[in-house]
């Protein structure tokens, strides 16, 4: 089944987002954290910036790295874009050293790499030739990762982009990819990391990079451009082979990843973004990836894990694919059946290896070399964690993926997925036993631009998401348990980092808040029993002429509730021509009279676990009156009357607590009755805690309160 | 063993169009880049553009652009160059071209020589 | 665009002889210690043959009286001892950026 829809929808404006942004600069696309210096590094349009990770609208220090115009104009005639194309668009951003960054940009189509001194904040000059390290055409996809002071990375190594690369930059080894349809089939280069074969780097010869992409599909023919997800792996050890496969990689080989629901012939073969979980409860890494299906008018988008340790086996156990014969070119490519050389072709020189004499890819075999390099592609595919997708969701394009795993209340685990969209906005989606629950969903841009870069910084309490896009950064905490204003709503979130405090009477964030978590309320299932202290209700006064239109209101905010009116204790329906709904959430009463005075109650009914939790959101009391005109008083401030409806119109400000709030005054368009702004919290108190008493040409106001016991 | 054919030779007039053949055999075609080279009399090589016979993805040197169209048809094996709004410059040998692994032409096909007069 | 350019244009040599063609490219066409400059041979009314691929590998079935050297921006092309089937045109080519690029050619006739 597809994933639900985010509980609760966040406005830009409604949350507490910081934003980073300097004005003329562009494409905020390149983001690198450094965590023990409380640093974000920025890699933008022309220049690289550093800002502060606790608040990134702190800027700590930037550095421009700008076109000539002479490079400017040489790249527009070649064909190129002056405005847009024929800039510097930083590209590469990986750490070199504590004191210096590695840094690439497109540099006008001639790419060029520089070491970023991190004390002074300059380049060194260094103008490194950056081809196959950064792609010539900021349009076109790339990746890298810094292991060991080396770059691996993947992009185009040509100006017109046709020649995919994999390669590594190092002074004593480079290596990279064969120019060949069978290795990489125009790619799109998606993600890159390093995975060390033991935590304490005892072993760093064994390590592997794994580099995850997209491309055309060599071994099944079809009408149209097939496209396939990828993973290829090369060993950090490799050396290149002596004469096959001089200065190549001789470890080189990539699977096939499924993401598919093969019960709705549902196939999701884009791959947009991966991120490798590791935590120290995890036996061993794990691969999110953010997939679209390949004609996706629909906005479908999936999510699959992939254990290390399936993606191992395939590359270490599994059958290899060969180029079918000659005069079969529409079989393409078929499973190798016959005998594989020893050493295993693609295999990375282990102390096995080394225990059989073969010290460095250099000694392997001619055999095993032309072997690995006539079959990199392996037949069998790598399959994700229970054979399907963790989340598939309809109406959406997932750009980018972190994940966070977090321990919940009860000392559960739980791995939070964190995903950008082509509109600007962060869903939040915890991975429970049997579902995925979609927490939330926060607008980070308000442009509904697409997120071009997403980082997740992991330091313990201090915990943030960075997204980049187009126009800046937005930096983003990782929940928001405070906007849960009650112990219903702060447990209906089913939110791992949130619980409630009886205490504080306040929804607070796990392993932030200060002092004990005793007595905090969290339910993951969302069973709400434990919220026994009702909050303060109120109610809501209203006085009515006879014939007139009463709008009643009420606040929700889950998406995942409906909203029931009680009259009497009696539901109503809005198939009278009595009542109507306006936004399913507030009341209209048409044609007032007598019969319609009493309790009006707003509730919200939301539907988790098969169970149905019930919540008051609104209490209104309605009398119907017959009123005599009344001189306003000189202390009195009159509504305006529409025709025969009262509007009553609710302050800005709605007032926590048990002051009264201060009376104010709220015109009314002659054409609509407007809604007041949105409640900044979900609403689930009855905010805002006062009562409206309307009379035609009469407003006064006064607040009272319900406790739990009062009759509901 | 491993081949490339060319169409045989073509007289156009100034202004038409003319489509070059190159048919693959011995080898997978799907596997390696298709190049297209051209000579002009007495003149030395130049490169116009290759293909992906995989994807039909084609990308040209910026003086051939608008001038060649490459396609390929996979079922067939054979690769195509055609040329457009014939000029008497554009009269040339034609050569398709295998890019092997190593980057370079280990394989050429005979050449087709189109010659453009009124 | 990387311009080839080779030296002499036309060289007369006696048989058995040894024939040097050079070439020098307009920037590097070196990457990470890998030089992409090939050598055709190219005979009246006949396609290119590759020759040496990668500055000094020797295609295979190519008499080893040819070889190849240089990096960077400079490189050559030796016949050790020059036989009678050897009178051609020879091409070098970049293959390390496009627009791929060849030289003007030499023509290489017998003394």
């Known amino acids: 089944a597809f994933a639900p829809v985010p509980r609760i929808t966040w406005e830009h404006g409604e949350v507490g987002l910081v934003k980073f942004h300097e004005p003329g600069i562009f494409n905020y696309s390149s983001l690198l954290m450094s965590e023990d210096k409380d640093t974000l590094y920025v890699g933008a349009r022309e220049a690289v910036f550093a800002v502060n990770a606790l608040d990134i609208s702190e800027k700590q220090h930037e550095v421009y790295w700008k076109v000539s115009e002479d490079k400017k104009s040489k790249c527009a005639e070649k064909g190129k874009s002056k405005q847009t194309e024929c800039l510097n668009y930083i590209r590469v951003l990986q750490p070199l050293s504590s004191t210096s960054l590695y840094v690439c940009g497109t540099n006008a189509f001639q790419p060029t790499c520089d070491h970023l001194n991190l004390t002074s904040f300059k380049f060194l000059g260094k103008s490194e030739d950056g081809k196959g390290r950064c792609p010539f055409d900021p349009a076109h996809s790339y990746t890298s990762v810094m292991v060991g002071g080396e770059l691996y990375s993947g992009t185009s190594y040509n100006f017109l982009g046709s020649e995919p690369i994999i390669s590594r930059n190092s002074s004593h080894s480079p290596l990279r990819t064969e120019y060949a349809i069978p290795w990489l089939n125009e790619p799109s280069f998606v993600f890159a990391d390093v995975i060390h074969k033991s935590p304490d780097g005892t072993e760093a010869e064994d390590d592997k990079v794994y580099f995850f992409f997209t491309e055309v599909s060599v071994e099944y023919e079809f009408v149209f451009k097939l496209m396939i997800p990828r993973v290829a792996r090369v060993c950090k050890g490799d050396q290149g082979g002596l004469r096959t496969l001089q200065k190549k990689w001789t470890s080189f080989l990539k699977a096939r990843l499924i993401c598919s629901r093969p019960d709705s012939g549902l196939v999701f073969n884009i791959l947009q973004d991966v991120f490798v979980l590791r935590a120290p409860g995890l036996k061993e890494p794990v691969f999110y990836a953010v997939f679209t299906p390949q004609l996706n008018n629909v906005g479908l988008s999936a999510v699959c894990a992939y254990t290390l340790s399936t993606v191992e086996a395939v590359f270490s156990r599994g059958k290899y694919m060969q180029s079918a014969t000659v005069e079969q070119s529409h079989t393409k490519w078929v499973r190798y059946n016959g005998p594989v050389p020893t050493p295993r072709p693609g295999a990375c020189i282990d102390s096995e290896a080394r225990a059989a004499n073969y010290t460095s890819s250099l000694n392997l075999p001619d055999k095993t070399l032309q072997f690995v390099k006539d079959h990199p592609l392996m037949d069998d595919s790598v399959t994700p964690i229970d054979n399907r997708p963790k989340l598939i969701k309809k109406d959406v394009n997932y750009t980018q993926i972190v994940v966070d795993r977090t321990q919940a209340l009860d000392g559960t685990f739980y791995d939070v997925m964190f995903l950008s969209t082509d509109r600007g906005a962060l869903h939040k989606a915890v991975i429970l036993a049997k579902e995925v629950h979609v927490v939330e969903e926060t607008q980070l841009f308000q442009d509904f631009e697409p997120v071009l870069s997403l980082l997740l910084s992991s330091k313990k309490g201090r915990k943030f998401v960075y997204a980049g896009s187009n126009s800046g950064v937005v930096q983003a905490p990782l929940a928001f348990c405070g906007k849960h204003s009650s112990c219903e709503d702060c447990v209906l979130a089913r939110d791992p980092y949130c619980a409630w405090s009886p205490a504080i009477k306040a929804c607070v964030t796990l392993h932030q808040a200060e002092g004990s978590s005793r007595g905090w309320i969290q339910d993951m299932s969302g069973d709400t029993s434990s919220c026994l202290d009702k909050s303060k209700e109120s109610f809501h006064q209203h006085f009515f002429k006879h014939g007139g239109t009463a709008e009643l209101k009420c606040f929700q905010k889950s998406n995942l509730a409906r909203v029931v009116w009680k009259f009497q204790n009696g539901e109503l329906k809005a198939v009278s021509p009595k009542y109507g709904f306006v936004g399913r959430k507030h009341l209209l009463i048409f044609n007032l009279s007598d019969g319609d005075s009493g309790v009006y109650q707003c509730l919200s009914e939301e539907r988790v676990r098969n169970k149905t939790v019930s919540q008051l959101l609104a209490k209104h009391i309605l009398e119907v009156k017959m009123v005599a005109r009344i001189p306003p008083s000189p202390t009195s401030q009159t509504a305006q009357t529409e025709g025969s409806r009262i509007t009553s119109k609710m302050p800005v400000a709605s007032t926590q607590g048990s002051s009264p709030p201060t009376p104010a005054l709220w015109a009314t368009s002659p054409r609509a009755a407007t809604l007041p702004p949105k409640s900044s919290s979900t609403g689930t108190s009855c905010e805002p805690k006062m009562v409206i008493n309307t009379v035609p040409q009469l407003h006064s106001e006064k607040t009272v309160y319900l406790k739990s016991s009062d009759n509901r | 063993q491993v081949q490339l054919v060319q169409s045989g030779a073509e007289v156009k007039k100034p202004g038409s169009s003319v489509k070059v053949s190159c048919k693959a055999s011995g080898y997978s075609f799907s596997d390696y880049y298709m190049h297209w080279v051209r000579q002009a009399p007495g003149q030395g090589l130049e490169w116009m553009g290759q293909i992906n016979p995989t994807t039909g993805g084609a990308s040209y040197n910026q003086k051939f652009k608008g001038k060649a169209t490459i396609t390929v048809d996979k079922s067939t094996s054979t690769a195509y160059m055609e040329l457009s709004s014939l000029r008497s410059e554009d009269t040339a040998v034609y050569y398709c071209a295998r890019y092997y692994y190593g980057r370079h032409f280990d394989v050429w096909g005979q050449g087709t020589t189109v010659t453009v007069s009124s | 665009d990387i311009v080839m350019t080779q030296s002499p244009d036309s060289l007369a040599v006696s048989l058995g002889e040894r024939a040097t063609i050079n070439c020098k490219a307009s920037q590097s066409v070196d990457y990470d210690g890998d030089s992409y400059m090939n050598w055709y041979q190219q005979k009246p009314g006949q396609p290119p043959k590759l020759l040496i691929y990668?500055?000094?590998n020797l295609e295979s079935g190519v008499p080893d009286r040819f070889s190849g050297s240089g990096s960077g921006t400079d490189f050559t092309l030796t016949i050790s001892s020059l036989q009678a089937e050897d009178v051609a045109v020879y091409y070098c080519?970049?293959?390390?950026?496009?627009?791929?690029?060849f030289g003007q050619g030499t023509k290489l006739e017998i003394k």
């Open positions: 990668a500055a000094s």
């Open positions: 080519q970049q293959s390390n950026e496009d627009p791929y690029t």
